[in-house]
Every structure is written in structure tokens, then in C-alpha cells.
């Protein structure tokens, strides 16, 4: 089947401090030497990506230095890290991978990851 | 709004050049990988190439490879396709059409008439 | 390369009528990569379908899609005017990027 299957877990609670992390895995086709992985969320039936990096099979990925990702690679496997989120982000975290090097090239698109995010209570003045 | 509008199309000679450029606006042109899109007078949609991202990635159909040149210019949010030693078989409208988040071609220009 | 080809090539039906378009693949393809497109006389193409069967923004729900393995169809429940059109299905999972040779929905 000329088609590339990612696997994702269905749903990640963050942490308290608006982390959360998943494991993204391809099937791959071929014998990749350049990957690209974007995450997209998808909430309300709108789309927005919200990272993308690309990186030689091997090698670290590198996001933007802005951005609020961060990941390392491991063979067919992208352990991917989302901070900075707040509770208004929970939604659907899709990972979508691209085999852009050497041809042919191939998509593959998650499920995607439900990512809860609750924000934490507001610690109470105490009176002493 | 999502727009592309392709220009440079005309008519030409067998074996002469012609350059196509495709105008994108009203998304981050660089987030995205763009393909040329063909069609025939009559005929059905044949994919022509397409160019990835930051530009260093392209693939072509077997039909125009080693004639055709895709390539970008993100600071100008613009396309091109160099097409070298046309034939009579390359006459069509060329689209240009932004590969999706998901993966179709989810916004297509108006197309360019090359005779 | 993945050859699609659709069935049939002209599909004549009065405005009301349920269309049926079929688009067999050469190989197994994971329908998940598998798109629709209408075209219209002089028009550029436009994306209906994604992924099989998720229609794109904008898309009426009389438009829908399904399938899997080698065989995906494209169904519309009841023709209006604006239909009557040519309509491609397109692999986009794997590089060359393949569409179909057509259907044209033309009315009765």
C-alpha cells in the first residue's frame, strides 16, 4: 500500500505548568533521509499549524526559536513537547510527516492527540 | 483572503522559453508547498511539479523533468515555473495551486494559457 | 506511479437526481490521501472532498464521499444546476501526484 500510516496517542493531559508531550511515529515507506513533521491543531473545524520542523534522519529537529516546540527523533519515532499552553488551547493535536528527501516523496497524517489543558487555581492570599 | 494569479503565459515557438510567475497572497507563502497543475485544451488535470517550503526540495512529473524549473522567492510571496525547449504538447492552461495542511491542492489561481 | 480511473466517463441525469461517480486506483491507496475536484467550463478547479470524505469549507452537504482499498466514490444526493460539471479524483499520499481522467455529470 503506497501510503505512510503515523501512529499518535489518542489523548495527553499537560501538566500543570502547560506542558504536554507525545509520541509521534511513522511507517515509512522508504528509506527517508530528510523528515518533516508539523504539528496542526484543529479545533472548531479550523486549522491552524502550530510548529514544523524538518531534520535529517539521525539528526536533532530544530523548530524556529520562537516556537513552542521542541522534540528529538529516534529512528521512525518524533517525541514531540508543546508548552506555554493554557486551558483555551485544548483541542485536537494532529502530526502530520512528510518524507520530503529523496524521492518519492510521501504524507502521512495522524489521528491526532486530544490535549486537555487546565489551567491551575490561583494560589489564595493568606491572611497572617 | 487566499489568492493566486498566475501570469506569463502566451503563445511561443517549438523549442523556445517562457517563464510563469504565480503571485500568492493572503497566507504565509512559506508554510506552504505550491504546485503547477496542467491541462490540455479538452484534456484532463496532469501535476506538473511542485516545490517545498524553503525551496530546496522539488519534484516533477516525468514529462517536463530536465526542461522544466520550479522555483520560489518566499521574500516575494512568489512562484515561478521556467519552462526550456517547449513542445507542441506542453500547449495548456498552467495552474498554480497551494498543497493544504491536509494535502490536496485546496486553492487553485485562475490559470495561464501557454500556446 | 498510481493510475486512477474513474467510471463513467459521462453521467447524464435530470436536476434531483442522485450522481454516482466512481474512481478505482491502480494499487491499494490509503483513502485517507485520496481527494475530489469539480470543474466547471473555463473555470479553475475546485477542491470538494479531502481525505475521502471530509468535505472542504464551503462545500454543501449534498456533496459526499467514501470508500477504501483501491475503490472510493463520490456522491451527490440530489443534482442542482450549479453541479453540472466535470469532477477528478486525485491521490495526493505519494509523489507523482495522480488525478483521474474525469467524469462529466451533464444534464439529461
Known amino acids: 500500500c503506497k501510503a505512510m500510516h503515523v501512529a499518535q496517542p489518542a489523548v495527553v493531559l499537560a501538566s500543570s505548568r502547560g506542558i504536554a508531550s507525545f509520541v509521534c511515529e511513522y511507517a515509512s515507506p522508504g528509506k527517508a533521509t530528510e523528515v518533516r513533521v508539523t504539528v496542526l491543531r484543529q479545533a472548531d473545524s479550523q486549522v491552524t499549524e502550530v510548529c514544523a520542523a524538518t531534520y535529517m534522519m539521525g539528526n536533532e529537529l530544530t523548530f524556529l526559536d520562537d516556537s513552542i516546540c521542541t522534540g528529538t527523533s529516534s529512528g521512525n519515532q518524533v517525541n514531540l513537547t508543546i508548552q506555554g499552553l493554557r486551558a483555551m488551547d485544548t483541542g485536537l493535536y494532529i502530526c502530520k510527516v512528510e518524507l520530503m528527501y529523496p524521492p518519492p516523496y510521501y504524507l502521512g497524517i495522524g489521528n491526532g492527540t486530544q490535549i486537555y489543558v487546565i489551567d491551575p487555581e490561583p494560589c489564595p492570599d493568606s491572611d497572617f | 483572503q487566499v489568492q493566486l494569479v498566475e501570469s506569463g503565459g502566451g503563445v511561443v515557438q517549438p523549442g523556445r522559453s517562457l517563464r510563469l510567475s504565480c503571485a500568492a497572497s493572503?497566507?504565509?507563502?512559506?508554510?506552504?508547498?505550491i504546485h503547477w497543475v496542467r491541462q490540455a485544451p479538452g484534456k484532463g488535470l496532469e501535476w506538473v511539479a511542485v516545490?517545498?517550503?524553503?525551496?530546496?526540495?522539488?519534484y516533477y512529473a516525468d514529462s517536463v523533468k530536465g526542461r522544466f524549473t520550479i522555483s520560489r522567492d518566499n521574500s516575494k510571496n512568489t512562484l515561478y515555473l521556467q519552462m526550456n525547449s517547449l513542445r507542441a504538447e506542453d500547449t495548456a492552461v498552467y495552474y498554480c495551486?497551494?498543497?493544504?495542511?491536509?494535502?490536496?491542492?485546496?486553492?487553485w489561481g485562475q490559470g495561464t494559457l501557454v500556446t | 506511479e498510481i493510475v486512477l480511473t474513474q467510471s463513467p466517463g459521462t453521467l447524464s441525469l435530470s436536476p434531483g437526481e442522485r450522481a454516482t461517480l466512481s474512481c478505482r486506483a491502480s494499487?491499494?491507496?490509503?483513502?485517507?490521501?485520496l481527494a475530489w475536484y469539480q470543474q466547471k467550463p473555463g473555470q479553475a478547479p475546485r477542491l470538494l472532498i479531502y481525505?475521502?470524505?471530509s468535505r472542504a469549507t464551503g462545500i454543501p452537504d449534498r456533496f459526499s464521499g467514501s470508500g477504501s482499498g483501491t475503490d472510493c466514490t463520490l456522491a451527490i444526493s440530489r443534482l442542482e444546476p450549479e453541479d453540472f460539471a466535470v469532477y477528478y479524483c486525485?491521490?495526493?499520499?505519494?509523489?507523482?501526484?495522480?488525478f483521474g481522467q474525469g467524469t462529466k455529470v451533464e444534464i439529461k
Open positions: 495551486a497551494r498543497g493544504g495542511n491536509w494535502g490536496p491542492f485546496d486553492y
Open positions: 493572503g497566507f504565509t507563502f512559506s508554510s506552504y508547498g
Open positions: 516545490i517545498w517550503y524553503d525551496g530546496r526540495n522539488k
Open positions: 494499487q491499494s491507496v490509503s483513502s485517507s490521501y
Open positions: 481525505g475521502a470524505s
Open positions: 486525485q491521490q495526493y499520499g505519494s509523489s507523482p501526484w495522480t
